[in-house]
């Protein structure tokens, strides 16, 4: 079957980082350059992404590869192929329609992306606070109170208060 | 056609000050957020500041923050980056963008300005 469509279709003969030039019999030409061809047999050669603004590259084109893109420092990839940049925020921080703003108390966010999420809920799992949650870490969960041995010291971590200077939102 | 036109650079000594400006010709500038975004040799494209379309709401990068201030003029088509205090490590290119989404946003449809150089002296 592959050499019958070869004797049929010329094309089928053609490389990836080429094409096949109609206009030069079907004879396989190189991609010109700035373009490229990931399979072979094909017709034309597609144009280099390039990767300008805010966007840089992190894999430069070949003729048979695509340019890849990331972000300028201070912002990181969303989307199929990096197709945006978001802006980051500090850790402590989620992005809004108003900007980076602090997690709400009881919430946190490790990351310089996606949104502050609710500290982990220890008594949900009969367990106790071991060391308490802030802006960007979550609480640390300790053993439950039934599991420490009599005599054991058992840290009772004071109610969680308020980060000064930070009110709720 | 849509294009975006950096001025106002210049040579300016340490502490001096200086006003560039970022025009629209072929789209309304008043629709769209920009962004502020500057290049030293040999460093990355770094974000400076961004005013939205919206309600006009103005943010800035801890390094620039209480001597740049961003505004915009919509019946000129016009946006302004007014630098003041201005120190060495502010030499660079200075370019505008206009991402189609927000300020925090940036897509390759965006529109980008060819820069403006400002060097400053100590």
């Known amino acids: 079957f592959e050499r019958t469509r070869s004797l049929q279709d010329p094309c089928s003969n053609c490389p990836a980082g080429t094409f096949c030039d109609n206009n030069r019999n079907q004879i396989c030409s190189p991609c010109p350059p700035n373009s490229f061809s990931s399979a072979g047999g094909q017709r034309t050669c597609d144009i280099c992404r390039q990767c300008k603004g805010v966007f840089r590259t992190r894999k430069e084109c070949s003729s048979t590869s695509n340019a890849e893109c990331d972000c300028t420092p201070g912002f990181h990839c969303l989307g199929a192929g990096c197709s945006m940049c978001e802006q980051d925020c500090k850790q402590g921080q989620e992005l809004t329609k108003k900007g980076c703003k602090d997690c709400c108390f009881g919430t946190f966010n490790d990351q310089k992306r996606g949104i502050c999420r609710p500290w982990t809920n220890c008594s949900l799992d009969g367990k106790s606070v071991l060391v308490n949650g802030t802006k960007e870490r979550d609480v640390v969960c300790g053993p439950s109170p039934a599991d420490l041995s009599p005599g054991a010291s058992s840290v009772t971590p004071p109610a969680p208060a308020r980060e000064p200077g930070h009110s709720p939102q | 056609q849509v294009q975006l036109q950096e001025s106002g650079g210049g040579l300016v000594q340490a502490g001096g000050s200086l006003r560039l400006s970022c025009a629209a010709s072929?789209?309304?500038?008043?629709?769209?957020?920009i962004g502020w975004f500057r290049q030293a040799p040999g460093k990355e494209r770094e974000w400076v500041s961004c005013?939205?379309?919206?309600?006009?709401?103005?943010y800035y990068a801890d390094s620039v923050k209480g001597r740049f201030t961003v505004s915009r003029d919509n019946a000129k088509n016009t946006v302004y980056l007014q630098m003041n205090r201005l120190k060495p490590e502010d030499t660079a290119v200075y370019y505008c963008a206009a991402p189609q989404s927000d300020c925090f946003h940036y897509s390759e449809n965006d529109y980008w300005g060819q820069g403006t150089q400002v060097t400053v002296s100590s």
């Open positions: 005013i939205m379309s919206s309600d006009s709401s103005a």
């Open positions: 072929g789209f309304s500038l008043g629709l769209y957020a």
